[in-house]
Interface confidence: low
């Protein structure tokens, strides 16, 4: 199970994971205390025909070939949380670690 | 966590859960003993800003907008195993549980 | 046998427009990235313009950004370079090549199609 | 832009000669590069891949070698149909770019 790293200056139009920082000062999220900047990573690029497929299904719904079925598409296979502080709905200081956040690694299905 | 379900006579347009039949014998996959076939489901629809984004990762991407980011598809984002009878690459008669063939929830992520 | 078949060249004014085709055959073409490389008579080979399988990312050399525009049909096997404002040093046999990472890196040319720009 | 550097630009030698040709980038190109052959008249053909890779049904003679920023193309016996001139490019960003070329002549 892999995945390719790609970055902004990559010749490779395949599916591949890409730096991406994620400022929640410049979005306006004030409610986030830390931290104000970190490294979330993103998945762009094409899924061709078995490249970087994470699970047989999808090469058996491209054999199928149903309506509507657009084919994979790149999207995270591997994902991390990050520690994060933050004020919820009540105006409470929260500690926690917050699912999903990072794409690790990214693949077509 | 929810997904939509659909059928072929569904008139939504977002992101949704079909309905698929998966033939082995139709496609000539000859080393599966059982089953013939089996209900694999596939995933299709569009994904509008923040519908059934299974990530807030999904979400800060949108508001990053990275070069190349082509927002989030419409993909699997619960899946169960099937339980298979095959001959392996030995023409070994193997029974064993195969992870991921059959689509359980629909997301956009 | 995988072909590719460049046609659409000949001789046009300055200023003028042309419009090459490239037809493919033999592999699948709605796999592959195609690119477009050119030759001044006497010269060296130059990139000039590239685009994914499904037309998702398009790249240009910046000595013809802005004047020639890339695209395909993959529903026809074609690749397609249309040539506008077109100057003296334009003038180049135009080869197309077809592309998918390094594997598949321009592993396959067309014989060519001669672009003469002059007045 | 990433710029190749090609040298030589021409070279003459004999048959049976052990020929080399060094391709240098401006910056690390990790091994994303290939080397290509052509004749008058002829469109390229792909003879090395990924720096050292040999095109099936190139001659065993042709071989690659280098990463990051140097990069050899040697034929290890030169053959009178080895008369080309013989380019560079690197695909590790846009825009691609071909090396300058090196015309290879058999005395």
């Known amino acids: 199970d892999f995945g390719l790293d790609c970055d902004e200056h990559s010749t490779e139009s395949r599916c591949c994971r890409y730096p991406l920082t994620v400022d929640f000062e410049a979005f306006g999220w004030d409610w986030i205390i830390a931290p104000k900047r970190y490294k979330a990573n993103y998945c762009s690029g094409e899924c061709e025909f078995v490249f970087l497929q994470k699970y047989p299904h999808t090469h058996l719904v491209h054999q199928a070939n149903p309506r509507g079925s657009a084919g994979p598409c790149c999207t995270p296979t591997k994902m991390s949380p990050i520690n994060m502080l933050y004020f919820n709905g009540k105006e409470q200081i929260i500690y926690g670690k917050i699912p999903a956040m990072v794409v690790d690694r990214c693949g077509c299905s | 966590d929810f997904g939509l379900d659909c059928d072929e006579h569904s008139t939504e347009s977002r992101c949704c859960r079909y309905p698929l039949t998966v033939d082995f014998e139709a496609f000539g996959w000859d080393w599966i003993i059982a089953p013939k076939r089996y209900k694999a489901n596939y995933c299709s629809g569009e994904c509008e800003f923040v519908f059934l984004q299974k990530y807030p990762h999904t979400h800060l991407v949108h508001q990053a907008n990275p070069r190349g980011s082509a927002g989030p598809c419409c993909t699997p984002t619960k899946m169960s195993p099937i339980n298979m009878l095959y001959f392996n690459g030995k023409e070994q008669i193997i029974y064993g549980k195969i992870p991921a063939m059959v689509v359980d929830r629909c997301g956009c992520s | 046998e995988v072909q590719l078949v460049e046609s659409g060249g000949g001789l046009v004014k300055p200023g003028g427009s042309l419009r090459l085709s490239c037809a493919a055959s033999g592999f699948t073409f709605s796999s592959y990235s195609m690119n477009w490389v050119r030759q001044a008579p006497g010269k060296g080979l130059e990139w000039v313009s590239s685009i994914s399988s499904s037309s998702s990312y398009i790249y240009y050399a910046d000595s013809v950004k802005g004047r020639f525009t890339i695209s395909r049909d993959n529903a026809k096997n074609s690749l397609y370079l249309q040539m506008n404002s077109l100057r003296a040093e334009d003038t180049a046999v135009y080869y197309c090549?077809?592309?998918?990472?390094?594997?598949?890196?321009?592993?396959?040319w067309g014989q060519g199609t001669l672009v003469t720009v002059s007045s | 832009d990433m710029q190749m550097t090609q040298s030589p630009s021409s070279l003459s030698a004999s048959v049976g000669d052990r020929v080399t040709i060094t391709c240098r980038a401006s910056q690390g190109i990790r091994n994303d590069l290939g080397w290509y052959q052509q004749k008058p008249g002829k469109a390229p053909k792909r003879l090395i891949y990924?720096?050292?890779s040999l095109q099936s049904g190139v001659p065993s003679r042709f071989s690659g070698s280098g990463s990051g920023t140097e990069f050899t193309l040697t034929i290890s016996s030169l053959q009178p149909e080895d008369s080309a001139t013989y380019y560079c490019l690197q695909h590790n960003s846009y825009p691609l770019t071909f090396g300058g070329g090196t015309k290879v002549e058999i005395k």
């Open positions: 990924g720096a050292s």
């Open positions: 090549a077809r592309d998918r990472g390094s594997y598949f890196l321009f592993d396959y």
